[in-house]
């Protein structure tokens, strides 16, 4: 904690301005009134404070708002946002997208993924759902940030908003997030024609179940290997060699390169070597010819 001292009369602060950059840490602590700071937060970012001085200003705001800052202060944090921890941000209630934009701009180029994720979470909570305006703001100012949201938060996305999501916005999404987003995307794009539907649904396919992947294999979609590799392992394993061949179309040629990587490796292990050989790609590791496959899972379920 900054040592408490009395403010010398000549150092008394009546407004937040450039002169404060010459104040030592303990002078700032003693002379800046927290309420004045909060009222004039819009001036702070224009003043080239050192990181040490910003620490003092943050400390003042923390004392004034132990339950979390009001949005009027949050909106004008500027570079002071870089001093915030996820724990600080968790106390906030943010509803304005202007606030979100301002802070996303400040965080660019800094290692603040945890803080940004918490901020976005607070915005979604504050606004009640992940609406189109919020998604548009995220895709414009923070590509990939959508995937920082928990599956629970993503469940508040209405299907009508899914169209605003671009493929690159989903690059960092994990399986659990895609599990939530895929059914919404399927609903959002259900009235599109075959090829147009596939282009739209492709980034979400990491959440698709086996039956949907099988259905795609009947539609001449020519799925690229990058998309195939992002499919859920559980969705790929039940596919037959013929189904994978039809699903990938001209991209089937790339299977050999991915032979050692999941889910291709796991899929190969489930196929008869004879069937794999029909592809003519040299895929190895299938069930040897003449071996019997016993499905013990049924017996286990009954025991």
């Amino acid at each position: 904690d900054v040592e408490r001292t009395t403010c010398p009369p000549e150092k008394e602060v009546h407004e937040i301005d450039e002169s404060l950059i010459f104040y030592k840490k303990r002078e700032l602590e003693a002379c800046v009134d927290a309420a004045l700071l909060a009222a004039q937060m819009d001036r702070v970012d224009a003043i080239p404070f050192t990181y040490e001085q910003l620490d003092v200003l943050k400390h003042k705001l923390d004392e004034l708002y132990p339950q979390g800052y009001p949005e009027s202060v949050i909106r004008h944090l500027g570079h002071l946002f870089l001093k915030m921890s996820p724990e600080d941000i968790r106390k906030w209630n943010v509803t304005s997208l202007e606030t979100l934009k301002a802070l996303l701009k400040v965080s660019k180029g800094h290692e603040m993924s945890a803080q940004v994720a918490t901020l976005i979470d607070r915005v979604v909570v504050g606004r009640g759902q992940l609406d189109k305006d919020t998604v548009d703001t995220l895709t414009a100012f923070c590509p990939g940030c959508l995937c920082s949201l928990s599956p629970e938060r993503l469940s508040s996305v209405p299907p009508s908003v899914i169209g605003a999501v671009r493929p690159q916005d989903l690059d960092t999404c994990g399986p659990r997030q895609l599990d939530v987003l895929y059914p919404k995307a399927r609903l959002a794009f259900q009235n599109m024609s075959g090829s147009e539907y596939f282009v739209k649904i492709r980034p979400f396919l990491g959440g698709a179940p086996t039956e949907d992947v099988k259905a795609l294999s009947q539609q001449n979609v020519s799925m690229d290997l990058a998309t195939f590799m992002k499919l859920r392992r559980e969705a790929v394993l039940p596919l037959t060699v013929a189904e994978v061949q039809k699903l990938l179309g001209p991209h089937v040629e790339g299977l050999k390169v991915e032979e050692q990587h999941s889910p291709v490796r796991d899929w190969i292990l489930k196929q008869r070597q004879d069937d794999l050989d029909t592809l003519g790609l040299g895929l190895q590791g299938g069930i040897p010819n003449g071996y019997l496959i016993l499905d013990l899972s049924v017996r286990e379920a009954l025991s």
Epitope: P250, D277, T278, L279, G280, G282
Partner: antibody, heavy 116, light 107 residues
């Protein structure tokens, strides 16, 4: 290391026969489709024939259908092209190649010259 | 049979240049197209498959685009080792057919 080595080329007269071989090493031969492709003097690449992994399915270019036969011996890791009723226009370097629709490995070729 | 027509049949360029070779199919082949690079006395090497997917180990300066009947191979910044003959080939249906080749020479 994958290697494909063609042999059996040479000079023959029109109407005669020739059998080309392609010895494969460095990979599981029986799991791959194989092709023959040729290139005539001063000409481009022309696909000739394809055989599937176990030899049960073959396809030919119209220009060689009924005259050429592709076959394989998976036990000996060898691909063959039996060429009958040879014509002057069959003169070319013949390459064996590994792959499905795309040929990812090629041999260095064997020259077949049909001339009287 | 599906005819494949490449253009230009020859072109000269300098190191660092951006080069584009086109290939046209006589009927719709979707994305069933590959591009090969062939150097004298060497076996052809597949660069691109499925019209736009880069084969493993091929430098990223090579890219392919197109679908249906019109396709393009682009080399973004020519390197000395890129001077060769380039062939397109369709694998949509038999007989497999190649373009006549495009010879890329040093200017």
């Amino acid at each position: 290391e994958v290697q494909l080595v063609e042999s059996g080329g040479g000079l023959v007269q029109p109407g005669e026969s020739l059998r080309l071989s392609c010895a494969a090493t460095g990979f599981t031969f029986s799991s791959y489709w194989m092709h023959w492709v040729r290139q005539g003097p001063g000409k481009g690449l022309v696909w000739v024939s394809r055989i599937n992994s176990d030899g049960t399915s073959t396809v030919y270019a119209d220009s060689v259908k009924g005259r050429f036969t592709i076959s394989r011996d998976n036990a000996k890791n060898t691909l063959f092209l039996q060429m009958n009723s040879l014509r002057a226009e069959d003169t070319a370097v013949y390459y064996c190649a590994r792959g499905r629709g795309i040929m990812t490995y090629w041999g260095q070729g064997t020259l077949v010259t049909v001339s009287s | 049979d599906i005819q494949m027509t490449q253009s230009p049949s020859s072109l000269s360029a300098s190191v660092g240049d951006r080069v584009t070779i086109t290939c046209r199919a006589s009927q719709d082949i979707g994305s069933w197209l590959t591009w090969y690079q062939r150097k004298p006395e060497k076996a052809p090497k597949s660069l691109i498959y499925a019209a736009s997917s880069l084969q493993s180990g091929v430098p990223s300066r090579f890219s392919g685009s197109g679908s249906g009947t019109d396709f393009t191979l682009t080399i973004s910044s020519l390197q000395p080792e890129d001077f060769a003959t380039y062939y397109c080939q369709q694998y949509k249906s038999y007989p497999l057919t190649f373009g006549q080749g495009a010879k890329l020479e040093i200017k």
